[in-house]
Interface confidence: medium
Amino acid sequence: IIPVEEENPDFWNRQAAEALGAAKKLQPAQTAAKNLIIFLGDGMGVSTVTAARILKGQKKDKLGPETFLAMDRFPYVALSKTYSVDKHVPDSGATATAYLCGVKGNFQTIGLSAAARFNQCNTTRGNEVISVMNRAKKAGKSVGVVTTTRVQHASPAGAYAHTVNRNWYSDADVPASARQEGCQDIATQLISNMDIDVILGGGRKYMFPMGTPDPEYPDDYSQGGTRLDGKNLVQEWLAKHQGARYVWNRTELLQASLDPSVTHLMGLFEPGDMKYEIHRDSTLDPSLMEMTEAALLLLSRNPRGFFLFVEGGRIDHGHHESRAYRALTETIMFDDAIERAGQLTSEEDTLSLVTADHSHVFSFGGYPLRGSSIFGLAPGKARDRKAYTVLLYGNGPGYVLKDGARPDVTESESGSPEYRQQSAVPLDGETHAGEDVAVFARGPQAHLVHGVQEQTFIAHVMAFAACLEPYTACDLAPRAGTTD
Amino acid sequence: IIPVEEENPDFWNRQAAEALGAAKKLQPAQTAAKNLIIFLGDGMGVSTVTAARILKGQKKDKLGPETFLAMDRFPYVALSKTYSVDKHVPDSGATATAYLCGVKGNFQTIGLSAAARFNQCNTTRGNEVISVMNRAKKAGKSVGVVTTTRVQHASPAGAYAHTVNRNWYSDADVPASARQEGCQDIATQLISNMDIDVILGGGRKYMFPMGTPDPEYPDDYSQGGTRLDGKNLVQEWLAKHQGARYVWNRTELLQASLDPSVTHLMGLFEPGDMKYEIHRDSTLDPSLMEMTEAALLLLSRNPRGFFLFVEGGRIDHGHHESRAYRALTETIMFDDAIERAGQLTSEEDTLSLVTADHSHVFSFGGYPLRGSSIFGLAPGKARDRKAYTVLLYGNGPGYVLKDGARPDVTESESGSPEYRQQSAVPLDGETHAGEDVAVFARGPQAHLVHGVQEQTFIAHVMAFAACLEPYTACDLAPRAGTTD
């Protein structure tokens, strides 16, 4: 499809002149940020951003690439170097330490410097690094964590936990030897390390004793509580705050978010990770956009401002499955949450950052025609005389070993939400990729987000913008911690 | 490998504080650019940039990702949307039209709006769009084109040519019907469309009549002149300018670049594309860095300034072959040229942009240890119990069809410059990818390079920065065309 007006040079010249005009008008704000929001698209490399843009555009009946994601509208962009201290290609634990704490760590560790070693409990103490969320809380701000994964997952855990093993969700996951050495599971740390005002996502089962049936799946033993210490962490958390409320479904969430008596809110909507957006039961589970809105309603009551972490955490999971349909529909919901947050906040006082922790070995090629489905086939056939998709993975489970031959594929197969795009190398799970990811920024001090930076820079920009430790002498006006 | 100093949080905190300090000091220049340089890494997507950074760092005995490419030092970054009017995933012709002329075109056309149709000669006239290089020349600046491909290739041709078929290098490539309709080959347009002061790259054979032996390969008929019209375009070009010089080897280039009597310089160092850097005979052929230096020496004599296009054009070719070694070593030489240009120019008066026309379906995954070879194997085995490389392609020629089984690979095989990384889909040539590419900017008006932009924006930023058409009323001081 060749759009008629795009045939005219005036179309492009006028568009670019407008973009130049907007660029010239950009004025770096010299004020501090009252509020901080970091939107984390887990596994959302640049190839995922572009493919999601096209899909979101096509869902609105456009050709696709000419449209804008909410994150595309952010005025400042940088590239972030995501390697961990010990790996060229990182995981979500080491990266969370980087962008939330400002220090790089080792693969699969969280909230610890690289002096800590994966799975070695005795390397924990003394190597803890403090997140920007923790520092925001100490400065009197309200803080929140919102994710589509379990709230004890690697990325959100970077905001509050310190662990040598990202898989230690509940005490049942922690070896007895490590428990004896005093290493706490992540769920325990969630409620004890610091006071978090809003906690929304999945992860019910890690909060309750073994044998506690799940309220949503009472007959499914595998979905019930996992804890060996007999603790009901939700009960413990509720006891800490007079205005605390725990919810486990969408209806309760929407009610609680509008209730002025609620000061602290924990919503855990699935036993483990939340369902993919395409599988979500919208009567029972809230969307990421709805959770983000609920969090902002509560947090924005604080005149000293807030810190909010919002994660589209299952973009990553879709890619690990080599199911691009899942990854991209998750990315669109993530972008919808960014858009809604933009409507509920002001860029005058809120620094919003959008980034990824790492990328995936996911590519979009094959010279497809403009307007054709992102999940479709490339024009022509491959050397083996079979069709191929425009979306492919370098490695992953989208690989059929029978006969060793690459399977043929039709447009209807490739468009299925369950379809796994093919890969060069057969793995049980497709891997992360090590290339730089984008950082999009808007609001006070967003202009500092520039060039090519270490991923750690993100945490430091947030801390500086809100005059938090170690940048309390930030020399920005109005000073952080005051109202507008 | 875990570097000891990186175990200490102070290392990261100090580094980030320094980066913040540098960010705070960034001051947008309000002056016009006297000089414009666009460095074009053909096919240099973000995954290529990161992999090249690691390789360049490791060639300097560092671990890799913590080091800086020359382009990494540019203070401003944007993302560029590369689609063509008719394709989600573009070619180098349509993209050259975008970043050099400021207007998007159709796949495989050059210097024409999208009203022109591929291969249809009669859609050329009236649809020509004018490059920034052409506008710079009209404003009295000197202009140059430097590339490692043939100078008539798609990317450089975007600076001076208008053609419905990027493959019409010489008249022998143009169908008789199109010739009769008045469509000119690209080589003819190179010398007749506009006055280009410096032309350096490959492409000798398209300039000489059929039967003319090549000076470097006189016994190889396939390398000799290809022209059917009997014209010697080099001779015609030399006749246009009293100070014109033609060279075909490195020694002559270095002499000519230092000769004050030379006002115009054409250097064509290979019959077709120049050799890959790893195959280059350094006694006969100059490197991209040397060509860039030679061009700058000549162009910088003009008190009104210059426009220079520098292309690392064979990054793309390495990827099309699924030979990452070639692509990445080409990227390093491209970066070396950027570095040298930075030493020879001042960011006070020179706007330098680095970008790619498009990406490739090239990925870097598998969780390799820090410091391990970028060409090495991932830890562990795949599901088929064979080793696999960290670098892979979504599609391409790195695919063995015999027996249908994926070949095993050793570290020594994967490290070979000839090794083709494996791909999911077997193609004769690996394809471009459609994700956004980075734009790096330094110098006057570089701050305008921000956010997510259409690729066309690049041409408009250059034109505006130097107060060229249509931005002659740019209101920047000192006015373009004046000396410092």
């Epitope: 759009p3 008629v4 179309f11 006028r14 609105k60 009946d61 050709l63 | -």
Partner: antibody
Framework: EVQLVESGGGLVQPGRSLRLSCTAS????????MSWVRQAPGKGLEWLAL??????????EYSASVKGRFTISRDNSKSILYLQMNSLKTEDTAVYYC??????????????WGQGTLVTVSS | DTQMTQSPSSLSASVGDRVTITCKAS??????IAWYQQKPGKAPKLLIH???TLQPGVPSRFSGSGSGRDYTFTISSLQPEDIATYYC????????FGQGTKLEIK
């Protein structure tokens, strides 16, 4: 030349059903989005329903005012667009237009219109 | 759903006058707005799409501008044949018409 001709309008009693047709010619029918728009006497234009093209699986969308009562469909072999209207109300009285989208840069602007067919719902 | 508020609902102008009609969207419609002219007993005729792109054959006295939520339709010099009702249409998110502006000659 693009042509759209509506038919099937007329007088119908409240609560009854009616099916409108729109016969298309002069273009490849399966390539384009098609819509129904109505205009009550002396009132403005109101978009009712959309059916997408072959590339997007002929999926449909409706305005809130007619969702559940009206159904848009197409017979691609005959190049005919339909609007099945059930449980008609007096306020459904209007001229009904079929319109074809032009797939420009802007996706789906209604570029070509039929002459309209009048539907009167009255007892 | 995106709402479109068109104003004025009617206006009277003289031949040669500059006439302006505005449409305000309830949310950012990304320039996806079209303008139609409808004469009594006739189907609407598309004049402008994508905010400012004139349809082939439409006189250049018609123009459009705007971005975000606010859009303007202008007739630079009113002609007698321009008497009609004009509608805006947003098509960023499905379709919504404005209420219409009836243009009369003074």
């Amino acid at each position: 030349e693009v042509q759209l001709v509506e038919s099937g309008g007329g007088l119908v009693q409240p609560g009854r059903s009616l099916r409108l047709s729109c016969t298309a010619s002069g273009f490849t029918f399966t390539d384009y989005y098609m819509s129904w728009v109505r205009q009550a006497p002396g009132k403005g234009l109101e978009w009712l329903a959309l059916i997408r093209n072959k590339a997007t699986g002929y999926t449909t969308e409706y305005s809130a005012s007619v969702k559940g009562r009206f159904t848009i469909s197409r017979d691609n072999s005959k190049s005919i667009l339909y609007l099945q209207m059930n449980s008609l109300k007096t306020e459904d009285t209007a001229v009904y237009y079929c319109a074809r989208a032009s797939f420009y840069y802007d996706g789906k602007v209604l570029a070509y219109w039929g002459q309209g067919t009048l539907v009167t719902v009255s007892s | 759903d995106t709402q479109m508020t068109q104003s004025p609902s009617s206006l009277s102008a003289s031949v040669g006058d500059r006439v302006t009609i505005t449409c305000k969207a309830s949310q950012d419609i990304n320039k996806y707005i079209a303008w139609y002219q409808q004469k009594p007993g006739k189907a609407p005729k598309l004049l402008i799409h994508y905010t400012s792109t004139l349809q082939p054959g439409v006189p250049s006295r018609f123009s459009g501008s705007g971005s975000g939520r606010d859009y303007t339709f202008t007739i630079s010099s009113l002609q007698p044949e321009d008497i009609a009702t004009y509608y805006c249409l947003q098509y960023d998110n499905l379709y919504t018409f404005g209420q219409g502006t009836k243009l009369e000659i003074k």
